[in-house]
């Protein structure tokens, strides 16, 4: 009789593939900067407050923090500062900065977002003389998304780390995973309820091998779930302790081996760590 | 090079309009603040106002804010000030000045200044 | 509105002589390792040309005989040694709050 083995090294597997687009969303595609701004990717609806959290890697005695937009030409157009910026013109009041107690974390945000303010944010951190410079955070993209009339879904919103695009793919994949979960929990009961001849047969292949069928095995639920932006960030599952023979029958659930599009990866990739804006937007930030 | 040309200094007859352009060059327009201030014959400094080119945001000194407009031509890097309602005190050099966006700092580069004469 | 007062309103001295012009807020203009308050010379028939910035900091291009220093309400500005070339009315200028202002100015003429 061929071994099988249970699911739980595959939902082990799945649950450490989950930890990847986050991951890729926070490096390597973002390089280290002496200000981070984040979640790299926000979306709101429109009339919701936007909140994007810029930290300094340290507190030095003098600076002006400042937050940016970026202009369709690259150039940084300035919103709000901490320290007031008690002068500036035309400053439009919806654009907060707020210093957090801990000092080292700003929350940027704008009140009653619009949908015109969809865009490429940064902050900048300027350091006066003597020792004058400017130091930019990487760039984050915040989507403003028309006021829905439907009621919020009861699951729980992904962290804002997700694109728009990729909130309702994981909402839906987490619905269908628990209801996979569910599904296999009655296998178990009904297997339990209803012993098979399969006494005595230990299902616990090692960790290494392969899945069989023998001429022997239970049917197999095939889900092809395509590719899945798993955006869980909890503790690593533990591989499931060896077992002793049971009687229970298991459902396998195959993923097939599909390589991710590269289209996908282009949500974190295309939010790049900050360059300097191209020659012929003259300077931005810096002055000449 | 960095520069602030002005133009549109005149005589004009109380009660009169003027229009003065500040042609900035050698830096990128917009990340720079545009101020305007004047000084009367022997007199000090007194600042009427600013713009910010990004979004053509301005502010006023509370004598000047019913009188004065100020604007900006991204596509020309210039700024104006408009001044209605003028009179004999409004007779003074006019100068277009500049301040880091990034910073509550100094005005580093100022127009060579355009002199306004309001008299019948 | 912000006064700036400045003394002395006129000063002559003799060149390789030290000079300083006093500029007093009505309030303070300092905050966290800041104090938002600039100096500026203007010599005849010219526009103002900024000197310091930020109470102590030497614009670009301006000689290192010229110093700011002060925070709060009083700052000072010091031409170590004085030069046929620094007559003009110097100015000191707060950027705190709106309205923006200048102090009156003092004359600073060379013998």
């Known amino acids: 009789m061929g071994s099988r083995r249970g699911p739980w090294p595959l939902v082990w597997a799945v649950l450490q593939l989950g930890w990847w687009p986050g991951w890729l969303l926070d490096s390597p595609d973002r390089p280290w900067s002496p200000l981070t701004f984040s979640p790299a990717q926000l979306t709101v609806q429109e009339g919701e407050n936007a909140t994007f959290t810029c930290s300094l890697a340290d507190i030095p005695d003098s600076f002006v923090l400042n937050w940016y937009r970026l202009s369709p030409r690259n150039q940084t157009d300035k919103l709000a500062a901490f320290q007031e910026d008690r002068i500036e013109p035309g400053r439009d009041r919806r654009f907060r900065v707020t210093r957090l107690p801990n000092g080292r974390d700003f929350h940027m945000s704008i009140v009653a977002a619009r949908l015109n303010d969809s865009g490429i944010y940064l902050c900048g951190a300027i350091y006066l003389p003597p020792n004058t410079q400017i130091n930019e955070s990487p760039r984050a993209e915040l989507s403003v998304t028309e006021r829905t009339l439907e009621p919020p879904t009861q699951s729980p919103s992904p962290p804002p780390r997700l694109s728009g695009q990729l909130q309702g793919l994981v909402i839906g994949v987490t619905s269908v995973l628990v209801g996979v979960l569910l599904l296999l929990l009655l296998t178990w009961v009904l297997a339990a309820v209803f012993p098979r001849a399969t006494r005595g047969a230990c299902v616990c292949g090692s960790e290494d091998e392969p899945l069989k069928e023998g001429p022997d095995a239970a049917p197999v639920f095939t889900l092809d779930y395509g590719e899945l932006d798993f955006q869980w960030r909890e503790k690593t599952p533990e591989p499931p302790a060896p077992c002793a023979p049971e009687q229970t029958e298991y459902a396998t659930i195959v993923f097939p081996g599909r390589p991710a599009s590269p289209g996908r990866r282009a949500s974190a990739s295309s939010l790049q760590g900050a360059q300097p804006p191209s020659p012929e937007d003259g300077p931005g930030l810096w002055p000449p | 090079e960095v520069q602030l040309v002005q133009s549109g200094g005149d005589l004009v007859k109380p009660g009169g309009s003027v229009r003065l352009s500040c042609v900035a060059s050698g830096y990128t327009f917009t990340s720079y603040y545009l101020y305007w201030v004047r000084q009367a014959p022997g007199k000090g400094l007194q600042w009427i106002g600013g713009?910010?080119?990004?979004?053509?945001?301005?502010n006023f000194s509370e004598k000047f804010k019913s009188r004065a407009t100020l604007s900006v031509d991204k596509a020309k890097n210039t700024a104006y000030m408009q001044l209605n309602s003028l009179r004999a005190e409004d007779t003074a050099v006019y100068y277009c000045t500049r301040r880091d966006s990034n910073y509550d700092g100094g005005f580093d580069y100022w127009g060579q200044g355009t002199l306004l004469t309001v008299s019948s | 509105d912000i006064v700036l007062t400045q003394t002395p309103p006129s000063l002559s001295v003799s060149p390789g002589e030290p000079a300083s012009i006093s500029c007093r807020a009505s309030?303070?203009?300092?905050?966290?390792?800041?104090?938002?308050l600039h100096w500026y010379r203007q010599k005849p028939g010219q526009p103002p040309q900024l000197l310091i910035f930020l109470a102590s900091n030497l614009e670009s291009g301006v000689p290192d005989r010229f110093s700011g220093s002060g925070s709060g309400t009083d700052f000072t500005l010091r031409i170590s040694r004085v030069e046929a070339d620094d007559a003009g009315v110097y100015y000191c200028?707060?950027?705190?709050?709106?309205?923006?202002?200048f102090g009156q100015g003092t004359k600073v003429e060379i013998k």
């Open positions: 309030k303070s203009v300092s905050t966290s390792g800041f104090s938002y």
């Open positions: 200028q707060h950027s705190w709050e709106l309205p923006l202002t």
């Open positions: 713009v910010n080119p990004s979004n053509g945001g301005t």
